[in-house]
Each structure stands twice: as structure tokens, then as C-alpha cells.
Interface confidence: low
């Protein structure tokens, strides 16, 4: 593909990514919408593994906090929005049942549009 | 989170999401850049769990395959691009060593811009 320096690529929405430990997270929302506790460690064959997640969200300090970059403002209002995905995690529910559940985590920052009325 | 379509919102890039099993995936790229085999099942205290992932990518059949929606075309070229993140998976490397590794999976479809030259 062509040379990216000549392409001078920019993101429509600025995001930040970080590793988040279960200790930082503490709780999460599972696929049924319930709040579960994220366990700090996962038992594996040779002991325990620290449970952590790679999360990406919209950058609150970024240029795009007021709206998306590069949008046709005559026709559209825009907003950068953090989107979520599901990852499996060892969790405990409100009834103290421990199990592997899919939980929601922040994975991206995307641009959403609404059409401008009354033009 | 609430459905953006209900709010009369449109995404700048159309995406599709699906559950992908380890059997479908077969291999993945780990954090060191190596190709690893994704194991179909994970041993848990009460037997085995099928290993699968929630993946999101740009919709190749969508309206936005030619460029992002809502962009100011006088000033910008645009492209919808699948982005990746890391999730932990039980994998086997080329030396047949089994272990939990972070692998890359598709998690979003975002819009990237390049400025139009020669205006």
C-alpha cells in the first residue's frame, strides 16, 4: 500500500488505550445486564494468572471531544462515542457464584452522526 | 448501552459483529507477533468450556465500503478500517507449548482520514 507519511492519516475520533487490571475494574456488566465482580486472579495449571484487559475509549483530552474530525458540518452533527465488546472473564455474581462469563469492556472510539434538521 | 439507531443515529462506518469459535479461527497473532494455534476448549473446574470470541469488523457489503459516511469530501479522503485489540486465549505456539496468551482480534470499524492535496 502507499506510503503512510504521504497519506498523513488521521483518526476521525481520538482514543486512548490501556491495560486495566481486575483490581482497577472491580465490577463489570455481563451479557444479561447484571453487575458482576471481576476476580483478580484466575487459577491455571501452574498456579494463578492476574486477570487484566486491554481497553480503548474516547480520549477525553483529545481534539475530538467536541465532535468528530473531518465531518461535513453543514449536514451532520457528530459525536465520538466509546463502544463496547464482550470478553470472557472469571467473575462472581450477586449470589456469590463464581464462573466464566462474558463481560462488557470498552474497545473502541467511533463516530456517530445525526442529521441536521431545518436546513 | 442503548441502541444508536433508536436515537436516529448513524455510524460513520458500518460494521458487523459475530461470535467466532476457536474452530473457525484456528490461528491468531500473539503479542510478540508470532502465529499461535487457538485451542478449541479450555479446561475449567467442571469440565471444559468452548473457546470463542466476539469480533467486530468493517462490513464489506456495507454502504461505507467506498469511504466513511458524513465526511467533508471537499477536504478529506476517508476509509473505514477494522481495528484490533487484545484478548486472552488458551493457545499453543510453534513449539507445542500451551499457555494463556493475549491474541489480536478484530474489535471495531473506525474511520481514518487523509487530507486532500492540491486544492
Amino acid at each position: 500500500h502507499s506510503d503512510p507519511a504521504r497519506r498523513g492519516e488521521l483518526s476521525v475520533c481520538d482514543s486512548i488505550s490501556e491495560w486495566v487490571t481486575a483490581a482497577d475494574k472491580k465490577t463489570a456488566v455481563d451479557m444479561s445486564g447484571g453487575t458482576v465482580t471481576v476476580l483478580e486472579k484466575v487459577p491455571v495449571s501452574k498456579g494463578q494468572l492476574k486477570q487484566y484487559f486491554y481497553e480503548t475509549k474516547c480520549n477525553p483530552m483529545g481534539y475530538t471531544k467536541e465532535g468528530c474530525r473531518g465531518i461535513d458540518k453543514r449536514h451532520w452533527n457528530s459525536q465520538c462515542r466509546t463502544t463496547q465488546s464482550y470478553v470472557r472473564a472469571l467473575t462472581m455474581d450477586s449470589k456469590k457464584r463464581i464462573g466464566w462469563r462474558f463481560i462488557r469492556i470498552d474497545t473502541s472510539c467511533v463516530c456517530t452522526l445525526t442529521i441536521k434538521r431545518g436546513r | 448501552h442503548s441502541d444508536p439507531a433508536r436515537r436516529g443515529e448513524l455510524s460513520v462506518c458500518d460494521s458487523i459483529s459475530e461470535w467466532v469459535t476457536a474452530a473457525d479461527k484456528k490461528t491468531a497473532v500473539d503479542m510478540s507477533g508470532g502465529t499461535v494455534t487457538v485451542l478449541e476448549k479450555v479446561p475449567v473446574s467442571k469440565g471444559q468450556l468452548k473457546q470463542y470470541f466476539y469480533e467486530t469488523k468493517c462490513n464489506p457489503m456495507g454502504y461505507t465500503k467506498e469511504g466513511c459516511r458524513g465526511i467533508d469530501k471537499r477536504h478529506w479522503n476517508s476509509q473505514c478500517r477494522t481495528t484490533q485489540s487484545y484478548v486472552r486465549a488458551l493457545t499453543m505456539d510453534s513449539k507445542k507449548r500451551i499457555g494463556w496468551r493475549f491474541i489480536r482480534i478484530d474489535t471495531s470499524c473506525v474511520c481514518t482520514l487523509t487530507i486532500k492535496r492540491g486544492r
Epitope: 488521521l10 486491554y54 483530552m61 | 503479542m31 510478540s32 473506525v110
Partner: antibody, heavy 121, light 108 residues
Amino acid sequence: EVQLLESGGGLVQPGGSLRLSCAASVFTFSNYYMSWVRQAPGKGLEWVAGINWNGAGDTYYADSVKGRFTISRDNSKNTLYLQMNSLRAEDTAVYYCAKQGVTHYNPMDVWGQGTTVTVSS
Amino acid sequence: EIVMTQSPATLSVSPGDRATLSCRASQTVGSKLAWYQQKPGQAPRLLIYGARTRVAGIPDRFSGSGSGTEFTLTISSLQSEDFAEYYCQQYYDWPPLTFGGGTKVEIK
């Protein structure tokens, strides 16, 4: 040994442009945040720009270069770039590329040897 | 922007002596602080990250301490190869990543 090798420096007139390249070897370049850092003659280190690994095009700039410099990367070529436009005398410095981590919350653990940019008429 | 301030600007020390370099952040940076060594004509080299973790291959005479806003790099017994410029850098809140102004450790 993990290496970064910068090129593209030189003498340029004020208002001119220059493109720096940084070739990476021996590590999985596409996994890491990368940054450019500069050092003016006899001065300290100044971070210039940074870029994400994941294809989202996320780029970050120091206020002093915003709108004039563009950081980009080509993972297929293991190469980082810095396109510098509208150069000023105060941009004169040694420019280093540096590898960070999988996120930007990491120090710069590998540095290139630097390439010198001189902006003068 | 987080401002990093290093002191002293120059430190004159005899070989074998202890050197203590300070770095102060204008607001908390947690433990997201790194120390770099730079010799004339060379690129910086990472010594310490996470405020106190030594990089593999760095001699144990180098140690880092502190958290929040106050940090210290200590060189317990200066060797001839340790005379150089030292920079602290925060990577807690960016952009921008910010460096201190540097401390030059010179032979007394």
C-alpha cells in the same frame, strides 16, 4: 539486538519540508506505540509526536508542532515516519524515534541513534 | 500539561561517592516515571521505569524511589562511565509526554 535507525535529516530553509524515517528491526514493530523525541543543541529532550499500533490512526502531537508535523507508520515495512512541514529555526534539533509499549502508558525502552535536522537560511 | 522539574541542574561528585538526583512533578504521576541516561553524542538510554524498576542489564548501583510527585534517582557509588546527563520523564498523562530539564552529573 533490537534496533531503530533514523534517516532523512539534513539542512532545510525556513518554511521548507522534510520527511524523517525510522526503520525498526528485531522486534514486532506493529505491536507498539512509537514516538518521536527531539533535542535542540545544548538543550533537553522534548517529545514531539506519538502513534498507536492498532490501525485506528490515533496520533498525538506536542503543541509546538501541531498542524505542521504528521506522524505515521507502515507496519508492513516496519517503518515510522515524521513529515515535517513549515519548518522553523526552532525545529533545529536531533530527532530520535523511540519504541514504547503496547499502550502509551509505557516508557521509551528503545531509541534510535538520531538524525540531525537544521533549519537555516 | 504536567511539568517535570529536576534538581540540581548540575551535580559535581567524586568517583565512588553517592549521587542523589531529584525530580518533581507539578501533579501526581503515580508511579509512571522513567529515568534516562544520556552521554554526549549518544541517544538516551532507559535506566528505570515505574519509578523504581531497573531495566535488565542496568547495574544495581542505580536505584529509583518515590511516587506521586516526588522522585529520586540514586547512584550509590559513581563509576567513571556514570558521568552523564540524566532525565526524568512522566508517562502518566499525555499528550504531551514530558521530560525534566535534566541533571548533569560531572566529575568533582
